[in-house]
């Protein structure tokens, strides 16, 4: 069974998938469609890297631009380095500026919804 066929079989169960499952899926050439991606749990999407999202979505990654103001894409963008977002070639804005250090302070982030940044 190829990645696409596998994805069709599990698509209906993906809404509650944890980050670990999404990371595993990104290695299986599934080309998740954007509608499915938009229904994923925000907390499961946030830890994914730009490279992982690109692999997870395949050609569907081009659709991120139209969804950049909507969750979970909006929140995910805020967590990524701008340099990494730029590699998607879509003009996505709102990432962490180059030279900033991200402190993973779970309590701070839970309260504010955004990562804590230290300037250069």
């Amino acid at each position: 069974m190829n990645g696409s066929e596998y994805f069709v079989k599990i698509q209906s169960f993906l809404g509650g998938a944890p980050t670990e499952d999404l990371k595993a899926l990104s290695q299986q050439n599934v080309s998740m469609d954007l509608a499915t991606f938009m229904k994923l749990r925000t907390d499961a999407v946030l830890p994914l890297t730009v490279a992982e999202v690109q692999k997870l979505l395949g050609p569907h990654v081009e659709g991120l631009k139209a969804e950049e103001r909507h969750r979970p894409v909006r929140d995910w963008i805020l967590r990524q380095r701008q340099d990494d977002l730029d590699t998607l070639g879509l003009g996505l804005q709102g990432g962490i500026p180059n030279g900033y250090l991200v402190l993973d302070l779970s309590m701070q982030e839970a309260l504010s919804g955004t990562p804590c940044l230290l300037g250069p």
């Epitope: 954007l34 690109q54 050609p59 569907h60 081009e62 659709g63 631009k65 139209a66 730029d86 590699t87 998607l88 070639g89 879509l90 003009g91």
Partner: antibody
Framework: QVQLQQPGTELVKPGASVKLSCKAS????????MHWVKQRPGQGLEWIGN????????YYNERFRSKATLTVDKSSSTAYMQLSSLTSEDSAVYYC??????????????WGQGTTLTVSS | DIQMTQSPSSLSASLGGKVTITCKAS??????IAWYQHKPGKGPRLLIH???ELQPGIPSRFSGNGSGRDYSFSISNLEPEDIATYYC?????????FGGGTKLEIK
């Protein structure tokens, strides 16, 4: 203003390869993927594939996977499509097109004038 | 892939008249359809996107409609410069597909 410049014509012999160009200007080249479209004489439009100009990653219509190779040169804001093992079936007008990402995956709002490729001995 | 079936393949109408072209998608495309005018020696010209949204500078004689799998495109008050081939494009999927085209002639 946005412009996509393509050479007018290319004449190539059967079995050879050709590299078509599309020079972009008037916008940030790395903020929009570039798409390629084929039109055979008297036929409709057919999507060939696209390329992310920032990291050079292409995606292809399965029909063209072994025929076309998409690349970019960021320094000159130019996209290229190489067509290999040319036959008369490849004689067509080839367009580059830029999408506008207002909704979903984006529709094409800017097009090149097209390059007419003739494959003939 | 999503197939787009466009009809008719050609049509002839009188100046000042009205024509309608249809495109049927092989699956629901959620109104993500655009319409283009194509003249020889030029790149296609975008007329309408998202089913019915007119591009800036395009006359209101051009209109679009539809939902789900069925879409239509109309030109009223036909003018000589409307002679062209018209195409629909679906962009609900990253692998874009066009309709087969409709060649419009004036009687």
């Amino acid at each position: 203003q946005v412009q996509l410049q393509q050479p007018g014509t290319e004449l190539v012999k059967p079995g050879a390869s050709v590299k078509l160009s599309c020079k972009a200007s008037g916008y940030t080249f790395t903020n929009y993927w570039m798409h390629w479209v084929k039109q055979r004489p008297g036929q409709g439009l057919e999507w060939i594939g696209n390329i992310n100009p920032s990291n050079g990653g292409p995606y292809y219509n399965e029909r063209f996977r072994s025929k076309a190779t998409l690349t970019v040169d960021k320094s000159s804001s130019t996209a290229y499509m190489q067509l290999s093992s040319l036959t008369s079936e490849d004689s067509a007008v080839y367009y580059c097109a830029r999408p506008y990402y207002g909704s979903s995956y984006g529709y094409f709002d800017y097009w090149g004038q097209g390059t007419t490729l003739t494959v003939s001995s | 892939d999503i197939q787009m079936t466009q009809s008719p393949s050609s049509l002839s109408a009188s100046l000042g008249g009205k024509v309608t072209i249809t495109c049927k998608a092989s699956q629901d495309i959620n109104k993500y359809i655009a319409w283009y005018q194509h003249k020889p020696g030029k790149g296609p010209r975008l007329l309408i996107h998202y089913t019915s949204e007119l591009q800036p500078g395009i006359p209101s004689r051009f209109s679009g409609n539809g939902s789900g799998r069925d879409y239509s495109f109309s030109i009223s008050n036909l003018e000589p410069e409307d002679i062209a081939t018209y195409y629909c494009l679906q962009y609900a999927n990253p692998l874009r597909t066009f309709g087969g085209g409709t060649k419009l002639e004036i009687k």
